[in-house]
């Protein structure tokens, strides 16, 4: 499919001007190849009417221009002095005519409207409300009012004086007469449809010495805006639609085939299961603008959207809308990164979050996606130290392994960890990505004992059972801060007797504090890692009190104080309910799990052939 | 569980000072978005000003943009609003408050602070500022 995007359909009038906006990805080669717009012949082939290397036909002459825009992915067509026979099909594109890289354009030059003399136009957008003014004379100051609408060749009456609604307007229109010193009256239409656009006719009294004025009305569709996005970005829609809808029901909807547009959500709560986990409504300001946010977007995203106001929360005739046409470039440079993380209860997730390598200063954040009325997205954690005070101890955003990717761990799972999590900064806005965590059946890998009370002065010993399947990661400890877990000295003890069926593979690797302080209180997490990718953590709380007896203290599995979430295990060993990060790329014998919604992704680990958008959890 | 408890408050002239304090108990005071509001007689409780977690930065009602500055301590879990130039009009019970939500909005970013009081989660009993003209 070609990456190069457009309008489908240009309207215009004759003796006006069009511009057309052409998108292409703004990679090197695309920003400085040549740039062309021609016109299809009816047996193919396409000939150039203006080229960014100069070139202009003798048709264009004078009247065109095409204007690159580079850093934008961009290049404007501007058509001045339309005629008729301008109307045609066209192509926007890159490179060679011939070569595909190219849209599609149907241009369509109408005749102006031949509009009798004195005749008044009105431009109102559909929706909208129309005021239609009509004077009158002294001597008609007492008689009918009307207003009628040309209907082939006969005059309708849409409403009068006398009370008169012409069912096609019955609610949304109504008849003013201004007061005695004003000889005007004035026709008030709402909700505008598309069916109300044509000629009126205004009269005042009915006899030969009535006052009549013609008015021609336009009603104008929207046109859509164009919105060129990548593949597993996020798009933002800005509706505005005026202070007079502001306490209407708002709605975002996609068009489907014909007329239908369903919704893709609406502050009445509802939202498109496609769309559950990746989709934002900002509750809407005071003069009735709203803003929707979707993240990872896909191929199939792509399409005609319209925003609009009605009570019911979806498209009627009449809602006063907004329109885009939405682009998916599949020729995304947002990386691919797994939609869906596994972990178990009591274990941890690794979440890997892509991030536009060029803005590395930017401020890096994780929120939970909320999805009660219109969906909330409350920020947990952030990379200036900013940790939600629910999960302290438990939650980490770390840097690594940078370039364009950063890392959240969240250990200790529950099954209320459950749900969707965006990966944000405050840099570019289209990088924004979700997550799913999903809870899996299982034991966490690794064993650390429940929460540890150490003795201010003496010596603590707290060990982290590690299996075999990890022995050729980096083992280590660290003591939790809300500005990440700084590393601490730690002693490989040998292998380790937590694990049935597991060979002198497995490692007991213990953390100790010498001459215990309580500065010492505090969080503790032993974990795994390759390199920068950081695979399973638990994490330990060590509580600090006063001195009672002498001695060093040496925390078995069994021996430490059970936390009421933990469960002891048939072998004497606990379990406390910790949580881990895990990278793809760390668990080669863990086979992924192909998601099903984007089978055409592969997987962003090079250890295994498998795809996957799913990446594995804490153990299988 | 954050427990908050503000002093500072008493009788002062037109055109004076007070400095306000809020006190706040455990150990994740900097999960916290501070905030300062006030209620006068008869009236409904508005919102006077907060602070982000790390005094990085602060918002403000417009009737006391300019006179008022609020601050935090975070190594004594401590937030202050120092009140210049005060008037008639300031008179009232300051309540101090916490919100640990901040959250990301598509229009405005990482919001920190909401001037909501819905948005709080946690409460002072409040300290009354009189202001005598």
């Known amino acids: 499919k070609s990456p190069i995007f457009g309008p489908e359909e240009v309207n215009s009038v004759e003796g006006n001007s069009v511009s057309i906006t052409c998108y292409y990805p703004p990679t090197s080669v695309n920003r400085h190849t040549r740039k062309y717009w021609c016109r299809q012949g009816a047996r193919g082939g396409c000939i150039t009417l203006i080229s960014s290397e100069g070139y202009v036909s003798s048709k264009y002459a004078g009247r065109a221009n095409l204007t690159n825009f580079p850093e934008n992915g961009t290049f404007v067509v501007n058509i001045a002095q339309l005629s008729q026979d301008d109307s045609g099909r066209y192509k926007c594109g890159l490179g060679i005519n011939s070569r595909g890289l190219s849209f599609d354009v149907s241009l369509e030059v109408s005749q102006g409207p031949g509009l009798l003399n004195d005749t008044k136009v009105y431009t109102v957008d559909l929706g909208r409300t129309v005021t239609i003014n009509c004077p009158f004379k002294t001597e008609n100051a007492q008689k009918r009012k009307s207003l009628y609408k040309q209907i082939g060749l006969y005059p309708v009456l849409v409403i009068d004086s006398s009370g008169y609604v012409n069912p096609n307007y019955t609610g949304r229109i109504r008849l003013d007469i201004q007061g005695t010193g004003q000889l005007l009256f004035s026709v008030v239409i709402n909700q505008l449809r598309l069916s109300d656009a044509g000629q009126y006719l205004c009269q005042a009294g009915d006899d030969s010495n009535s006052n009549k004025k013609n008015a021609d009305l336009q009603v104008l569709k929207p046109e859509p805006e164009l919105v060129y996005e990548d593949l597993r970005g996020s798009v933002t829609f800005h509706c505005a639609l005026g202070p007079e809808v502001a306490n209407v029901a708002k709605f975002l909807c996609r068009q489907s085939s014909g007329e239908n547009c369903d919704v893709v959500v609406n502050t009445l709560g509802k939202r498109a299961p496609a769309f559950e986990g990746r989709i934002l409504l900002n509750p809407q300001d005071k003069d009735g603008s709203f803003s929707v946010v979707i993240t990872g977007l896909r191929k199939e995203d792509a399409g005609r959207y319209l925003c609009g106001a009605h009570s019911d929360g979806q498209l009627q005739e009449g809602s006063p809308i907004q329109a885009w046409q939405l682009f998916v470039n599949e020729e995304s440079t947002i990386p691919r990164s797994p939609t869906v993380v596994k972990g178990v209860a009591g274990g941890s997730v690794a979440v890997l979050c892509p991030y536009n390598r060029k803005e590395s200063k930017s401020i890096k954040y994780w929120c939970l996606w909320e999805g009660a009325q219109n969906g909330r997205c409350p920020l947990l954690v952030d990379s200036e130290g900013w940790v939600k005070a629910q999960y302290e101890g438990r939650l980490s955003l770390l840097e690594e392994p940078g370039n364009g990717t950063f890392t959240v761990i969240l250990n200790q799972l529950t099954s209320r960890d459950a749900g969707f999590y965006w990966c944000l900064t405050n840099g570019d806005t289209l990088w924004r990505t979700t997550v799913e965590i999903k809870i899996i059946e299982g034991e966490p890998n690794l064993k650390v004992p429940g929460n540890v009370t150490a003795v201010l002065g003496e010596t603590l010993k707290v060990p982290c059972h590690f299996p075999c399947k990890f022995s050729s990661y980096e083992k280590y400890w660290c003591k939790w801060n809300n500005t990440g877990c700084q590393a601490l000295p730690s002693q490989d003890e040998g292998p380790s007797k937590a694990f049935v069926n597991c060979d002198e593979n497995s490692r007991l690797v213990s953390l100790t504090l010498n001459l215990v302080t309580r500065a010492d209180e505090g969080w503790y997490w032993c974990g795994v890692k390759q390199g920068h990718f950081y695979g399973e953590t638990a994490a330990v709380y060590v509580a600090v009190e006063e001195r009672k007896a002498a001695g060093s203290r040496d925390v078995s599995l069994a021996k430490a104080d059970a936390a009421p979430d933990e469960k002891v295990l048939d072998s004497g060993f606990r379990e406390i309910e910790n949580k881990a990060i895990q990278d793809p790329r760390l668990f080669a014998e863990e086979k992924a799990v192909a998601d099903t919604r984007d089978q055409a992704d592969g997987s962003r680990a090079s250890v295994d052939s498998g795809s996957s958008e799913e990446q594995g959890g804490s153990s299988r | 569980e954050v427990q908050l408890v503000e002093s500072g408050g008493g009788l002062v002239q037109a055109g004076g000072s007070l400095r306000l304090s809020c006190a706040a108990s455990?150990?994740?005071?900097?999960?916290?978005?501070m905030g300062w509001f006030r209620q006068a007689p008869g009236k409904e409780r508005e919102f006077v000003a907060a602070i982000k977690w790390n005094g990085g930065s602060t918002y403000y009602a417009d009737s006391v943009k300019g006179r008022f500055t609020i601050s935090r301590d975070n190594a004594k879990n401590t937030v202050y609003l120092q009140m210049n130039s005060l008037k008639p009009e300031d008179t009232a019970v300051y309540y101090c408050?916490?919100?640990?939500?901040?959250?990301?909005?598509?229009?405005?970013?990482?919001?920190?602070?909401?001037?909501?009081?819905?948005?709080?989660?946690?409460w002072g009993q409040g300290t009354l500022v009189t202001v005598s003209s």
């Open positions: 408050a916490a919100d640990g939500d901040p959250y990301f909005s598509p229009t405005d970013g990482i919001v920190w602070h909401a001037p909501h009081q819905s948005e709080y989660d946690y």
């Open positions: 455990g150990r994740t005071f900097t999960s916290y978005t």
